[in-house]
């Protein structure tokens, strides 16, 4: 036999208490696949989160950071402080990258200098807090 | 760490009205579906309804007696309970999800629930 929830459409739910009879989601949720006996609440992106998706009754809401800020996780489910080139984010803020190494975005951690050495070459151009060395014969 | 308290529960006579609160603290309900349910001495937790987002869902037992609503400016939502029937006697709990309706839910969290004995 036929499960009649298979016959609602994305954008609905089953109404279990309503001889499964298929009911809209409320505003602000949604149903991304057919046949479903819940709606999902939206996600709200709030604060440091801007909406870069809007929800629809058939998909949940995108977020995105504000600037000054970039995502992390998984559906930017967070949003971490932007350092400058050169410095790299520590529990105490924005640190200048040590002598040795660099950061070349605006995110992650400062990374050592190529040692060129290793593969038998010579430094052409130094490295700075923002760039790697680069490496010549 | 959420914390639901229901507060508003009590002994009243058949054919009396109730209003039950569920009030949130560590987290606001703008994010969540609200939902009561009741549980009887001996029997097994029953569906009364959910809240969300000006709509309410409700359980096939209660024949438009109860009613959901909330106060987004007190973060609080009722339970408004009216012509009373003995089999209304339940210890009623409030509950949050990022689902809805939570007729088929466990919820995320649910608060320690609060008394309602219907008799004359």
């Known amino acids: 036999l036929q499960d009649p929830c298979s016959n609602c459409p994305a954008g609905t739910f089953c109404d279990n208490n309503r001889n499964q009879i298929c009911s809209p989601c409320p505003p602000n949720s949604f149903s991304s696949a057919g046949g479903q006996r819940t709606c999902d609440i939206c996600r709200q992106c709030k604060g440091v989160f801007r909406t870069r998706k809007e929800c629809s009754s058939t998909s949940n809401a995108e977020c995105d950071c504000t600037p000054g800020f970039h995502c992390l996780g998984a559906g930017c489910s967070m949003c971490e402080q932007d350092c400058k080139q050169g410095q790299e984010l520590t529990k105490k803020g924005c640190k200048d990258c040590c002598f040795g190494t660099f950061n070349d975005q605006k995110r992650g951690i400062c990374r050592p200098w190529t040692n060129c050495s290793l593969d038998g070459k010579s430094v052409l151009v130094n490295g700075t807090k923002e760039r790697d060395v680069v490496c010549g014969p | 760490q959420v914390q639901l308290v229901e507060s508003g529960g009590g002994t009243v006579q058949p054919g009396d009205s109730l209003r039950l609160s569920c009030a949130a603290s560590?987290?606001?309900?703008?994010?969540?579906?609200v939902g009561w349910f009741r549980q009887a001495p001996g029997k097994e937790r029953q569906y009364v309804g959910t809240?969300?987002?000006?709509?309410?869902h409700y359980g096939d037992f209660e024949n438009n007696r109860f009613t959901i609503s909330r106060d987004n400016a007190k973060n609080t939502v009722y339970l408004q309970m009216d012509n009373l029937k003995p089999e209304d006697t339940a210890v009623y709990y409030c509950?949050?999800?990022?689902?809805?309706?939570?007729?088929?839910?466990?919820?995320?969290?649910q608060g320690q629930g609060t008394q309602v004995t219907v008799s004359s």
């Open positions: 560590g987290r606001t309900f703008d994010n969540y579906a």
């Open positions: 509950a949050i999800s990022l689902k809805y309706p939570m007729a088929t839910v466990t919820p995320d969290y």
């Open positions: 809240y969300w987002s000006g709509y309410a």
